[in-house]
Interface confidence: low
């Protein structure tokens, strides 16, 4: 094996076509040098992935009750920088870097309870705005998915996580505007809301509506309202969800994790930091032999597809041995 | 053999301050999440706070945010809990514990928050 | 809610199998780990991320966490297993918040 030195703060493998790791991957409870050599005569328990249960472990080379992956590395187990195209938020959801969070339509008519209900169950909560650009960022999305767009032309209003609270009924109606969940303090409220059409007499709450006006030519206006509505009555809504970690495949992962982020190579491995891949290493593939012209698979860490006109369509670039 | 070696508990009054340390050795401390537990007389554990590796991150149980801050000096191996406006319910053994899950815990210092 | 419940006590003779259980919410999402502490002393790690054991630990612990549930069970319990043990995992509600269930006094009848 050819001499070669690790960088400050990386871990030589004694063995194996792995040559250097991070150095807190030593001792960490998972081998991931091919001879186990980090695991070896370490004095302590090593670290457990911190709790979550979603995710592929990748320096395992095994999913969670899965089949080995084809996770096969050559040389140094490189660190990259990532950019912005990896993903932070699941398929269908808007990501905003200003809150780093994701938000979603749900075009489904609920009422405000159980559209609360169902944003909780994704993770999330109905949406509060902590800044004008936030709420602008918001307006801007085309929301629409192609198939449901009349549903969303018809029913242009959000439930989002405020209340109206009424305080007097004297010559009108007096309140003020709360945030319906407990969350984030830096919110801002809302101004004087438009009030629906009919409302009860008993209602001492009701709930937030804003409304989008998504015709293209007033789109770039902002333009849009807020309504207090009788928060049994039946809307599509928007949920609001801090930024995560995602993966190829589109699986949400948990802090601490290793995962291969969504973006355009599947030979990144990372850890998952508040919702950002950290300290992430991409392996090195051997080209495959005995083909000139080869495609990578755009899923599949150094699996090729071979575009000679009589070569083999599907090469792995390792060799047998080194599995 | 990790060794999380505590000082710092005492009797205090109510409103006062006090600060807890935990001194790490046998493991690459710098690598590691570390949290602080506490367990009321007869009571049983909870969850206090937790600060990551590098000491950017911190979290609070809801019952302390704002009175105690976490912290660390990786250069020592030592974790810290300031405990700040004290109130006759923080009285409790406090435990230091390394890492999420934690694996290896302090001994435990009592801290008595009496007038 | 973002709670784990325990049973506060459980008894089992000398060389049987207990299983002690923790439910949970956010134990659907997240791995669960197993203290046990005994009288004065600081709490003790027998399981993480559901089953595994850390070394030192005797192959008599075992995990596991099904749906809203996780179990510790002791197979051939032996005297010095009397203590309470306690659940913990993250909560759902507070991703780095962390979450311990009331415990579970286990009592070892000769």
């Known amino acids: 094996r050819p001499e070669l030195r690790c960088n400050p703060g990386q871990f030589a493998c004694h063995g194996g076509t792995i040559q250097c790791i991070p150095l807190p991957w030593q001792c960490d409870g998972w081998p991931t040098c091919e001879d186990k050599s980090d695991e070896a005569d370490c004095p302590v328990t090593g670290e457990a992935r911190p709790y979550g249960k979603e995710t592929v472990d990748l320096r395992q080379g095994r999913a969670r009750g899965g089949d080995p992956t084809h996770f096969h590395t050559v040389n140094v187990a490189q660190p990259v920088r990532f950019s912005s195209f990896l993903g932070k938020c699941p398929s269908g959801w808007h990501h905003y870097e200003g809150t780093a969070s994701c938000y979603r339509v749900y075009l489904s008519g609920e009422n405000y309870w159980d559209a609360a209900q169902t944003c909780q169950r994704v993770n999330g909560s109905l949406a509060t705005f902590s800044t004008d650009q936030e709420l602008r960022f918001v307006l801007a999305q085309e929301w629409d998915q192609p198939e449901r767009s009349f549903g969303w032309k018809d029913q242009r209003k959000l439930w989002v996580g405020y209340q109206y609270v009424i305080t007097g009924r004297n010559h009108s109606l007096e309140g003020r505007w709360e945030v319906a969940f407990k969350g984030s303090p830096e919110v801002f409220l809302p101004p004087d809301p438009i009030f629906a059409s009919a409302m009860s007499e008993n209602d001492n709450v009701f709930c937030a509506q804003l409304q989008c006006f998504h015709f293209p030519t007033l789109r770039h206006h902002d333009l849009h309202s807020w309504h207090a509505e009788s928060c049994s009555e039946k809307s599509s809504f928007l949920c609001k969800r801090s930024q995560t970690c995602v993966d190829i495949k589109d699986n949400v992962v948990d802090e601490g994790f290793y995962f291969t982020p969504k973006g355009d190579d599947p030979c990144l491995s990372c850890t998952c930091h508040r919702g950002e891949p950290e300290m992430c290493v991409a392996a090195l593939c051997e080209r495959p032999q005995g083909c000139q012209q080869y495609r990578k698979d755009p899923k599949e860490c150094c699996k090729f597809m071979c575009l000679d006109p009589d070569g083999s369509s599907l090469f792995d670039s390792m060799a047998s041995g080194m599995r | 053999e990790v060794q999380l070696q505590q000082s710092g508990g005492g009797l205090v009054q109510p409103g006062g301050s006090l600060r807890l340390s935990c001194a790490a050795s046998?493991?690459?401390?710098?690598?590691?999440?570390m949290s602080w537990v506490r367990q009321a007389p007869g009571k049983g554990l909870a969850w206090v706070s937790a600060?990551?590796?590098?000491?950017?991150?911190?979290y609070y149980a809801d019952s302390v945010k704002g009175r105690f801050t976490i912290s660390r000096d990786n250069s020592k191996n030592t974790l810290y809990l300031q405990m700040n406006s004290l109130r006759a319910e923080d009285t409790a053994v406090y435990y230091c514990a390394k890492n999420w899950n934690l694996d290896y815990w302090g001994q435990g210092t009592l801290v008595t928050v009496s007038s | 809610s973002s709670e784990l419940t325990q049973d506060p006590a459980v008894s089992v003779a000398l060389g049987q199998t207990v299983m002690i259980t923790c439910q949970g919410h956010?134990?659907?999402?997240?791995?669960a780990s197993w203290y046990q502490q005994k009288p004065g002393q600081a709490p003790l790690l027998v399981i993480y991320?559901?089953?595994r054991r850390p070394s030192g630990i005797p192959d008599r612990f075992s995990g596991s966490n099904s749906g809203n549930t996780a179990s510790l069970t002791i197979t051939g319990t032996q005297a010095e297993d009397e203590a309470d043990y306690y659940c913990n995992s993250r909560d759902s509600s507070g991703h780095h918040n962390v979450l311990f269930g009331g415990g579970t006094k286990l009592t070892v009848l000769s």
């Open positions: 600060i990551s590796s590098s000491g950017g991150d911190t």
């Open positions: 991320g559901d089953n």
């Open positions: 956010s134990l659907r999402s997240y791995y």
């Open positions: 046998e493991f690459p401390f710098s690598s590691y999440a």
